[in-house]
């Protein structure tokens, strides 16, 4: 069951794993629901009655049975992971804990304007796991207004103590908010020299990059492969650091890949969760289970829907058929299986089973990063949860209709285009609707998200001249579904990827005089380069702000009704919004592409409106 | 952990100079300020100067002509020289990490005597 | 220059006693003094920071108290091995400064 509730003065006696800090009740619940075997936890809060070493120890705690027995305590405050529970994990901590000392290891010390400035200075150092900031009225005045930036072994704090006129907090790179270098490529037969920091088993290297990834201290890494000569070593996944941040020295192997943590890549961290079954392979770890099933997406359900199952192998069993020879039955054994760490203790090949992981840390995920199967005028209807971050904005003055699309990109963000707001007076006469596929399902009763504010770009004039892009802040905040989640923006790091499966979609018209669509249409379209748009557009200027996509046989294109929808394309399984629906001249006609706001431009615009002020 | 060690000459000459290592382990220089305290025998404590991990410094007035403090980040190690040493230079000389202008770890000391 | 000044250069105590010693600044240092504690052949131990915060692994038995320009730190009941000097020191500006010390003997 999935218990969100906090108990407080109470204490889960027994059971404990591990003890650290953290400098409040929430964050404990956080660090225990990405522990490997943390069930349940008991914060010590401040408390007059409690021995103030002991306050902010987080204890982490598991029990065989899922509970353990509560106690009375004044100051303690338990709770259960949200491992149990359906609902997105986010890592992702930006609270500022005023008169709070996070003890770490200091490693840098500058001064600073402000504690979101120390903060962003943290989130943009490769090392930097929390801060601490002396404020302006701090009694020291050489250490007035000083950030120091701390790292420590696990990534949380050693001690957290009581501090007048200090401010402390964490990293937002797991808020997808670092400015450092994203290097998503894989290097093949590389292995690196740099000192390991931690080593684990893993079938494959892309299990080597995501452990490494969500590692507080790993930078980069190097898996060594089931065909690498030295037997005790396959399978190994290295992880690895170094005081620049980057690896030292490269050196060629067959049997090696080496890689990058993802941890600094805006919206695109993978998540621990591998979803592949890995055949002809049997992990070892300490036996939790074993239960009959058909087949292995069976084995791997029951372990995902087993708590404490961390992976699992499925061996087939080999029965005669009725024509008498061997075969592999569908009906198996199901080991489930768990480890100190995660990861399997051993990796075996060539006994027949078949492994995996659970798939419960799948949630965990950075929500715009869901593998999503994919694949408007000349375009194709769209199936239901296709495109899970396009809404439709209904204005509902003087009557209610369709206005424009829009992208959500965050719980409380929809971003979409400037120019859908001439008419606009009030955000009040603005709906969006999301996890709509036809515009018929909306009726009276239909649940919709008012909009608290509309941002538009204050260089928008027009959308031929370009800033053709507006923020929606909605007035509550919205729960991820299949059907409505968002996009990943693209990052600034990412401007070389050349993206080949690019979509737009919308409910617009499918010919220039037409009507709204009914069902969200979407059309495949290549992008074209600046150059050949500017060709096609004489009378005006293509900006680096701009994008253009379409076929020059027209055919397939945004219209009237699309705009402010996504340009959503694919790079490595992870869709990226590239543009926004803007402008054209007609729709789809021969040499005339649509031109669409480029994002990737206005991605620190984006980024400084939706902070919390 | 957090260790501090000072190595000094031991003895020297008035109107020489003095140079003091202070090397660290445990922390690194770039995160945290390094102090100078000396303590003549028999007597108190005094605050000579220190090092910030920026590499700022300041120094105690009386002494501001004749000190300075340096560090080599790379190899944890801060230096402070003195010169026109006097015989009432003579004392223990500590290095210390600061924690927020106090000090929370202190080396053993190394002793130095000033005389002919 | 900031000067402290601790008016007792030795106090007299005996195991169980309350024993409170003071420093004076010449200026006013906020709450940034601290008091160190100094035992024959040994280096400085930090006590107390920011005039009241206990550093790690310090005995709740030791206590500070104060603000501006008058500081005292106090031990509530006096052990054996507390019989050493204790010295104030501001660290509102630099130069940073120390008081002369106090030294705790047995009565």
């Known amino acids: 069951d999935c218990v969100t509730k906090l108990f407080k003065d109470t204490l889960f006696q027994g059971g404990d794993i591990s003890t650290v800090f953290t400098p409040s009740a929430e964050h404990c619940q956080v660090v225990c629901t990405h522990h490997p075997r943390c069930l349940l936890f008991t914060f010590m809060a401040e408390s007059p009655t409690e021995d103030p070493t002991k306050w902010f120890t987080c204890v982490l705690k598991d029990s065989i049975t899922e509970t353990l027995p509560k106690v009375n305590m004044s100051g303690a405050i338990s709770g259960y992971s949200f491992k149990q529970c359906p609902h997105q994990i986010n890592a992702c901590n930006n609270h500022l804990y005023v008169d709070l000392d996070m003890k770490g290891m200091n490693y840098k010390d500058s001064v600073a304007k402000s504690a979101h400035e120390c903060q962003e200075r943290c989130t943009n150092d490769i090392h930097c796991h929390f801060f601490t900031y002396a404020t302006w009225s701090f009694p020291s005045e050489q250490h007035r207004n000083v950030c120091l930036l701390k790292y420590t072994q696990m990534g949380t704090p050693t001690r957290i103590m009581k501090i007048n006129e200090v401010v402390s907090g964490f990293s937002l790179k797991s808020c997808a908010l670092s400015n450092l270098a994203c290097i998503r490529d894989i290097f093949p037969r590389t292995g690196f020299a740099d000192s390991n920091i931690d080593s684990v088993l893993v079938p494959d290297v892309f299990v080597c990059q995501s452990i490494c990834t969500h590692h507080p201290n790993c930078l980069f890494f190097t898996f060594l492969s089931k065909d690498w000569p030295k037997e005790s070593e396959r399978n190994l996944c290295l992880l690895k650091s170094s005081l620049s941040g980057l690896p030292s020295t490269r050196y060629g192997k067959d049997n090696a890949f080496s890689g990058f943590s993802l941890q600094n890549c805006r919206h695109s961290v993978p998540v621990l969760c591998h979803s592949s079954f890995y055949p002809d392979t049997d992990f070892l770890g300490e036996e939790l289970d074993i239960v009959d099933v058909e087949g292995r997406e069976a084995c791997q359900k029951v372990c995902t829907d087993t708590l404490r199952c961390q992976f699992f192998t499925y061996s087939p069993s080999q029965q005669p058929s009725n024509k008498g020879n061997l075969f592999p039955s569908c009906r198996g054994k199901c080991y489930l299986k768990l480890s100190l760490n995660g990861s399997p203790t051993k990796i075996l090949h060539g006994r027949g089973g078949i492994s995996g992981y659970t798939l419960r840390l799948c949630k965990m995920d950075n929500v715009c990063t869901n593998r999503i199967n994919a694949r408007i005028v000349g375009g194709t209807a769209s199936v239901y949860s296709e495109w899970p971050w396009q809404i439709t904005l209904h204005t509902t003055s003087p009557t209610q209709r369709h206005l424009c699309g829009g992208s959500i990109i965050g719980n409380q963000w929809i971003l979409t285009a400037a120019h859908c707001f001439i008419e606009v007076d009030s955000p009040k006469i603005l709906r969006v609707y999301s996890g709509i596929l036809n515009q018929s399902e909306i009726k009276e009763d239909t649940t919709f998200f008012g909009v608290q504010e509309i941002i538009i770009h204050d260089q928008y004039k027009m959308a031929e001249s370009g800033y053709d892009i507006a923020l929606l802040k909605l007035e509550t905040t919205m729960n991820y579904t299949d059907f409505q989640r968002p996009i990943c923006l693209p990052s600034k790091s990412d401007r070389n990827i050349t993206y080949t499966e690019c979509w737009v979609t919308g409910w617009g018209y499918r010919k220039l005089r037409d009507k709204i669509q009914n069902t969200l249409q979407k059309a495949k379209v290549p992008l074209i380069t600046n150059d050949e748009c500017q060709t096609r557009y004489t009378g005006h200027k293509i900006t680096n702000k701009m994008v253009c996509a379409g076929y020059k046989e027209g055919g397939r294109d945004a219209c009237k009704g699309d705009s402010g929808g996504p340009l959503s394309c694919k790079h490595k399984e992870v869709w990226y919004l590239v543009g926004i629906t803007s402008w054209g001249e007609g729709c789809a006609q021969s040499g005339r592409p649509g031109v669409y706001t480029n994002v990737i431009e206005y991605v620190d615009w984006i980024l400084e409106k939706t902070q919390p002020a | 952990q957090v260790q501090l060690e000072e190595s000094g000459p031991g003895l020297v000459a008035p109107s020489q100079s003095l140079s003091i290592t202070c090397t660290v382990s445990g922390f690194s220089l770039t995160g945290y300020g390094i102090y100078w305290v000396r303590q003549p025998p028999g007597k108190g404590l005094e605050w000579l100067g220190m090092?910030?991990?920026?590499?700022?410094?300041d120094y105690n007035s009386a002494l501001k002509s004749r000190l300075s403090i340096s560090k080599d980040n790379s190899k944890s190690q801060v230096f402070l020289k003195m010169n026109s040493l006097q015989t009432d230079d003579t004392a223990r000389y500590y290095c210390?990490?600061?924690?927020?202008?106090?000090?929370?770890?202190w080396g053993q000391g190394t002793t130095l005597t000033v005389s002919s | 220059d900031i000067v402290m000044t601790q008016s007792h250069k030795f106090m007299s105590t005996s195991v169980g006693d309350r024993v409170s010693i003071t420093c004076k600044a010449s200026?006013?240092?906020?709450?940034?003094v601290a008091w160190y504690q100094q035992k024959p052949g040994q280096s400085p131990k930090l006590l107390i920071y920011l005039t009241s915060y206990r550093n790690t692994g310090v005995p709740d038995r030791f206590t500070g108290s104060g603000s501006g320009t008058d500081f005292t730190f106090t031990i509530s009941s006096v052990q054996a091995e507390d019989l050493a000097v204790y010295y104030c020191?501001?660290?509102?500006?630099?130069?940073?400064?120390f008081g002369g010390g106090t030294k705790l003997e047995r009565l």
């Open positions: 200026q006013d240092v906020s709450t940034a």
């Open positions: 210390a990490r600061d924690y927020y202008g106090s000090k929370d770890y």
């Open positions: 090092i910030w991990g920026d590499g700022r410094t």
């Open positions: 020191q501001q660290h509102y500006k630099t130069p940073y400064s």
